[in-house]
Interface confidence: low
């Protein structure tokens, strides 16, 4: 009862709500809901009812299982959806479903910040740019991952010869997708074409 | 027709607290979602709270919002609003209705006044 | 949110009069949901109209309701003394629900 369910899914995709568990048998009613009382659709009497939404048009209701189609969804469809039963014996059962809808992350752009030659050894200064978004990170030298510390949108090391990687990546990712940007040097210290 | 009786309302200081309650009769009161709904003297209506049939879910209206909660006892058919943190501006008549197929208000109750004042 | 607003504040007639209340919504109100509620001194209010025009259970002939997206009117069409109140809009196609600031019908 009320167990809420999370569910992460890419922007554009068709989604498919549904419970674990099989419905109450014959039930009465049934009701799909976003936030707490706006209504999707209703099954009713044998019949779905699909109420005016920003969603008319782009859900579908199978009785059989209560599980709600939703197609194209967008970031604007983040919400909490509630599946409300109504039982023949007159109690009502609900589940909860929290969707969030991310969109696929841009390809990142990798920034130099700082590049300098210091004896043989290269100070870098790397920072991955991307468009106001709530993603991880992963450095890669040379396909190499950099150490977990390192994790963040700015990469800072000192690059001695025994150490020296040609190419730089930074790896954006979230639940849904994940884009590369990678940036290469020139020993000893100099900015090569990508 | 169902019925709605509200109790609990009276006097409290600011930063007290009451509990209101709302005797429903008539009804299978387990199948209907429930709000309070408020209204300080001379002044319009201002809905607060919202459960629903189960209790499972319940949503507070910005205003109140940390300070009240609303819940229910379906086996007693009574609603309750734990109002914490009282202040002036929550002095107003409290009633209690039944939010209809989640859109309207309909039937209320009589109303219980709630004044805060030191 | 979505704000009501009611005009007039106050409307005074005589009875057999018709009466003409209006709220106008600050954004279209979603598949005009929308209802009306009569409320008398020292009493609950009470349902009248919802979705914009359907009468409440055992609501006389003589209220109706009409209008769509922004722009929505409460008719009473001869006024009874009975009828003499204040009257509120809430819309429901939007969270939070939100009420008008009321209408007072009173006797000229």
């Known amino acids: 009862q009320g167990h809420l369910v999370h569910m992460t899914v890419v922007s554009g995709s068709n989604v498919t709500l549904n419970i674990s568990e099989s419905l109450p048998e014959n039930y009465k009613q049934l009701t799909w809901f976003y936030t707490f009382d706006q209504k999707i659709v209703e099954w009713d009497s044998r019949k779905s009812k699909y109420f005016e939404s920003k969603f008319k048009g782009r859900v579908r209701l199978d009785p059989q299982s209560g599980a709600l189609y939703i197609s194209k969804v967008q970031k604007e469809d983040n919400s909490t959806y509630i599946m409300r039963v109504l039982k023949k014996t007159g109690n009502e059962q609900e589940w909860k479903i929290k969707l969030q809808v991310l969109d696929p992350v841009p390809k990142p752009v990798i920034k130099i910040e700082k590049i300098e030659d210091m004896d043989d050894n290269c100070y870098l200064k790397l920072s991955c740019v991307i468009p106001g978004e709530s993603v991880n990170y992963t450095w890669y030298g040379d396909k190499r991952p950099f150490p977990k510390e390192l994790q963040n949108s700015v990469l800072e090391t000192t690059l001695m010869p025994h150490n020296y990687s040609r190419c730089y990546t930074c790896q954006v990712s979230n639940s849904v997708s994940s884009k590369n940007g990678t940036v290469c040097l020139s020993p000893p210290c100099t900015l090569a074409r990508s | 027709e169902g019925q709605l009786l509200e109790s609990g309302g009276g006097l409290a200081q600011p930063g007290g607290s009451l509990r209101l309650s709302c005797a429903a009769s008539?009804?299978?009161?387990?199948?209907?979602?429930m709000s309070w709904v408020r209204q300080a003297p001379g002044k319009g209506l201002e809905w607060v709270s919202l459960?629903?049939?189960?209790?499972?879910?319940?949503y507070h209206a910005d205003s109140v919002k940390g300070r009240f909660t609303i819940s229910r006892d379906n086996s007693k058919n009574t609603l309750y609003l734990q109002m914490n943190s009282l202040r002036a501006e929550d002095t107003a008549v409290y009633y209690c209705a039944i939010y209809n197929n989640y859109n309207w208000f309909d039937p209320w109750g009589q109303g219980t006044l709630v004044t805060v004042s030191s | 949110e979505i704000v009501l607003t009611q005009s007039p504040g106050t409307l005074s007639l005589s009875p057999g009069e018709r009466a003409t209340l209006s709220c106008r919504a600050s954004?279209?109100?979603?598949?005009?949901?929308l209802a009306w509620y009569q409320q008398k001194p020292g009493q609950a209010p009470r349902l009248l109209i919802y979705?914009?025009?359907s009468r409440a259970t055992d609501i006389p002939d003589r209220f109706s309701g009409s209008g769509s997206g922004t722009d929505f009117t409460l008719t009473i069409s001869r006024l009874e003394p009975e009828d003499f109140a204040v009257y509120y809009c809430?819309?429901?196609?939007?969270?939070?629900?939100?009420f008008g600031q009321g209408t007072k019908v009173e006797i000229k």
């Open positions: 459960i629903s049939g189960s209790g499972g879910s319940t």
């Open positions: 008539g009804i299978t009161f387990g199948r209907y979602a």
């Open positions: 954004q279209s109100v979603s598949s005009n949901y």
């Open positions: 809430q819309q429901y196609g939007s969270s939070p629900r939100t």
């Open positions: 979705d914009a025009s």
